[in-house]
């Protein structure tokens, strides 16, 4: 729909979901909380010095499959983990870095809790 | 169609409690965010707080913590607000409202509450 | 909290005429993720609880007449009424849902000559 001025209401409109974000908290969340029309994530990766990093937080609706698609990346471990069922759901995310024999597949399956 | 119904008008005594209602129907709860808006006579409007009636997940103003206590009731699709310790400062009308953003699309006719010996 | 305000906090107008109020916002409501501004307006006619006319700045909601134009971008914002009509009589409240706690603007009343 047009943002500028002469569009009317899309039916059903998307209900707001509420996620829990850290080391990826938007300028508008408030107490470690984000707002979302998508899904909420959580994922772990290997820093510079191979040490793991767990971020979470929110992800719109537009391209959220293919974020939420696990595809492993050549010489990067890293897994991401989605949900939707309710607020804070990402709370009960725990993603676990893939073994070093994956990270040359090509392709990974979507992760949705 | 959508509507939000309250009871038109409360009476209570100072340092009581009050459990106002608002009846949602002619939509699926669920797929609202229900909200709760004070506006004191002649004055502006204030947001206390929302809940999601689909995990009962509650998000409040600051000003209200301790105030206000947002329940539902999925079964009757009724969703209410608790106002405690009252004082006149909470003579209010009292709106309720829905929203799937956080903006409110669809409001409540409002209860007047009056605080008042 | 972001501090909403309105002016002027009244007007009065002939029918047929162009109609024009803002709001101002303490701090910008612009998401940079979907370049949308989380601003809605309402009007609240006398003994009536209030009714969305726009929302995301200048999305019309359904139903809605199309002399109400919403306006702006970042932290000014302009609501216009391109004729007055005599059931326009009311008060105007804008209000921010970028971050909680929602806040609304003081109002604006406008009452027809």
């Known amino acids: 729909k047009k943002e500028d001025g002469e569009s009317t209401a899309p039916t059903p409109r998307p209900k707001i979901l509420r996620c829990k974000c850290h080391h990826h908290c938007p300028e508008d969340s408030v107490n470690n909380i984000c707002s979302t029309d998508g899904y909420c994530f959580t994922m772990i990766e290997e820093d510079d010095s191979g040490m793991p990093v767990v971020t979470s937080g929110c992800l719109g609706l537009e391209g959220s499959d293919f974020q939420c698609r696990d595809t492993p990346i050549p010489h990067q471990r890293r897994s991401i983990e989605c949900c939707t069922e309710r607020n804070e759901c990402n709370k009960d995310l725990h993603p676990t870095l893939p073994p070093l024999k994956n990270r040359d597949f090509v392709d990974g399956p979507i992760h949705h809790k | 169609q959508v509507q939000l119904q309250q009871p038109g008008a409360e009476l209570v005594m100072p340092g009581a409690s009050v459990k106002l209602s608002c009846k949602a129907s002619?939509?699926?709860?669920?797929?609202?965010?229900m909200h709760w808006v004070k506006q004191r006579p002649g004055q502006g409007l204030e947001w206390i707080g929302d809940?999601?009636?689909?995990?009962?997940?509650?998000n409040y103003n600051h000003k209200f913590k301790g105030k206000a206590t947002l329940t539902v009731d999925k079964s009757s699709s009724t969703a209410y607000m608790q106002l405690s310790s009252l004082t006149s400062e909470d003579s209010a009308v009292y709106y309720c409202?829905?929203?799937?953003?956080?903006?409110?699309?669809?409001w409540g006719q409002g209860t007047t509450l009056t605080v008042s010996s | 909290d972001i501090v909403m305000t309105q002016s002027p906090s009244s007007l009065a107008m002939s029918v047929g005429q162009k109609v024009t109020m803002s709001c101002k916002s303490s701090?910008?409501?612009?998401?940079?993720?979907?370049?949308?501004?989380?601003l809605a307006w309402y009007q609240q006619k006398p003994g009536q609880s209030p009714k969305l006319l726009v929302y995301?700045?200048?999305t019309r909601e359904s139903g809605v007449p199309d002399r109400f134009i919403g306006s702006g971008s970042g932290t000014d914002f302009t609501l216009t009424i391109s004729s007055v009509q005599a059931e326009d009589l009311a008060d105007y409240f804008c209000?921010?849902?970028?971050?909680?706690?929602?806040?609304f603007g003081g109002g604006t009343k406008l009452e027809i000559k």
């Open positions: 409202a829905r929203s799937g953003w956080d903006y409110f699309d669809s």
């Open positions: 002619g939509y699926t709860l669920t797929n609202y965010w």
């Open positions: 809940i999601d009636p689909s995990d009962t997940y509650t």
């Open positions: 701090q910008s409501l612009l998401k940079s993720s979907n370049q949308k501004n989380y």
């Open positions: 995301f700045a200048s």
């Open positions: 209000q921010q849902y970028y971050r909680i706690p929602w806040t």
